[in-house]
Interface confidence: low
């Protein structure tokens, strides 16, 4: 933070801050702890007060350090904790499978191990490993097919 | 320090096919998604094509869908938008950007691709 | 799909001036809304995310504010370096779309 001189005697930097000089300025380097010109203030993003994946952002309110949140898409308010209309309001995702938002009408459904599809309702076929010997499972209609290494063969490569 | 560099823009003749590459360096690549933007001779900023993470997630604007695919090597840090069919409005200064914050937080310097016959 | 409209699309302003850019949507956007800087060799820069906050390393005369369909990008004390041109861009539907640009230039 770019403050006073911090070298001179009251002006030095506390809780720890360090007093480094560059391009001909002084300026207190605080440790994660604390902020402002002198490191005098906590800082007041480790409480980590946004929530829902928001962004806490420190600043500087009438010379008080404060906080202001930047909401992750779907989510609006001075915490992030208004969930606006959006495509994962109404859990698309089945089988445990997580909703990402990509826009507030678009989703993408991240699915569990076994499972496949736009919102996790296939059950991936190739989830058991059934090809042995190194063969390469493709799903094929609602069962697989194996592609297999030089020398064997079969449905499942054996 | 974050750079984005494309590469593969020329002069094609219209029906004709272009391969544009995007070669990142100073972040981990993967963990970003990738947008492709286009800038047409009046100046105006078209999104073209999204992709996510793993490249298992694509999204298209409604005047390339079809004809235009993103990709991406994440081993090798780069974004790819293999354009076919191409037309004479397809003209443009294509420029490859990385998604942060729900933005595209840096954008390489961009590849000049001319339609014409 | 969302229009964005920069209904100025070129600017002159004095260096030291307060310069507001204005840009709207064709519906509400939720502060879904990005600003991006062209210098005029072609470098583009993100500016401004979610309406209000501040890319690293952007100077602190730039501000934007807005809500609803109406939004704006402030630059209060205009310096050389700022001669370019400002696009908005709105991310709650996809395709994602800009506003055609407002150049600013020096009086």
């Known amino acids: 933070a770019r403050g006073p001189r911090c070298s001179q005697p009251g002006e030095t930097c506390l809780n720890g801050g360090k007093c480094e000089a560059a391009n001909g300025t002084e300026a207190c380097v605080c440790g994660g702890a604390f902020v402002g010109p002198r490191c005098q203030d906590p800082n007041p993003c480790l409480s980590t007060p946004c929530k829902n994946a928001g962004t806490c952002h420190v600043v500087d309110r009438r010379g008080v350090a404060d906080y202001a949140c930047s909401c992750a898409l779907g989510f609006s308010g001075p915490l992030c904790l208004t969930p606006l209309d959006n495509a994962c309001l109404t859990n698309p995702c089945r089988n445990g499978g997580t909703c990402d938002l990509l826009t507030l009408t678009e989703y993408k459904c991240r699915c569990p191990p076994g499972w496949s599809g736009k919102s996790c309702q296939q059950a991936d076929p190739c989830a058991s490993n059934p090809c042995a010997n190194g063969g390469q499972c493709l799903p094929f209609e609602a069962s697989y097919i194996c592609h297999c290494p030089p020398s064997f063969h079969g449905p499942t490569c054996r | 320090e974050v750079n984005l560099v494309e590469s593969g823009g020329d002069l094609v003749q219209p029906g004709g096919s272009l391969r544009l590459s995007c070669a990142a360096s100073?972040?981990?690549?993967?963990?970003?998604?990738m947008s492709w933007v286009r800038q047409t001779p009046e100046k105006r900023l078209e999104w073209v094509a999204y992709?996510?993470?793993?490249?298992?997630?694509?999204s298209y604007s409604d005047a390339i869908r079809g004809r235009f695919t993103i990709s991406r090597d994440n081993a090798k840090n780069t974004l790819y938008l293999q354009m076919s069919s191409l037309k004479s409005e397809d003209t443009a200064i294509y420029y490859c950007?990385?998604?942060?914050?729900?933005?595209?937080?840096?954008w390489g310097q961009g590849t000049s691709v001319i339609v014409s016959s | 799909d969302i229009q964005m409209t920069q209904s100025t699309s070129s600017l002159s302003a004095s260096l030291g001036d307060r310069v507001t850019v204005s840009c709207s949507a064709s519906?509400?956007?939720?502060?879904?809304l990005n600003w991006y800087q062209q210098k005029p060799d072609g470098t583009l820069k993100l500016l401004i995310y979610?309406?209000?906050n501040l890319h690293s390393g952007v100077p602190s005369r730039f501000s934007g504010s807005g809500s609803g369909t109406d939004y704006s990008l402030t630059i209060s004390n205009l310096e050389p370096e700022d001669i370019a041109t400002y696009y908005c861009?709105?991310?709650?539907?996809?395709?994602?779309?800009f506003g055609g640009g407002t150049k600013l230039e020096i009086k």
């Open positions: 100073g972040f981990t690549f993967s963990s970003y998604t």
């Open positions: 992709i996510d993470y793993g490249g298992d997630f694509t």
């Open positions: 519906q509400a956007i939720s502060n879904y």
């Open positions: 861009q709105q991310y709650s539907k996809f395709p994602w779309t």
């Open positions: 950007s990385r998604r942060r914050y729900d933005a595209m937080d840096y």
């Open positions: 979610y309406t209000t």
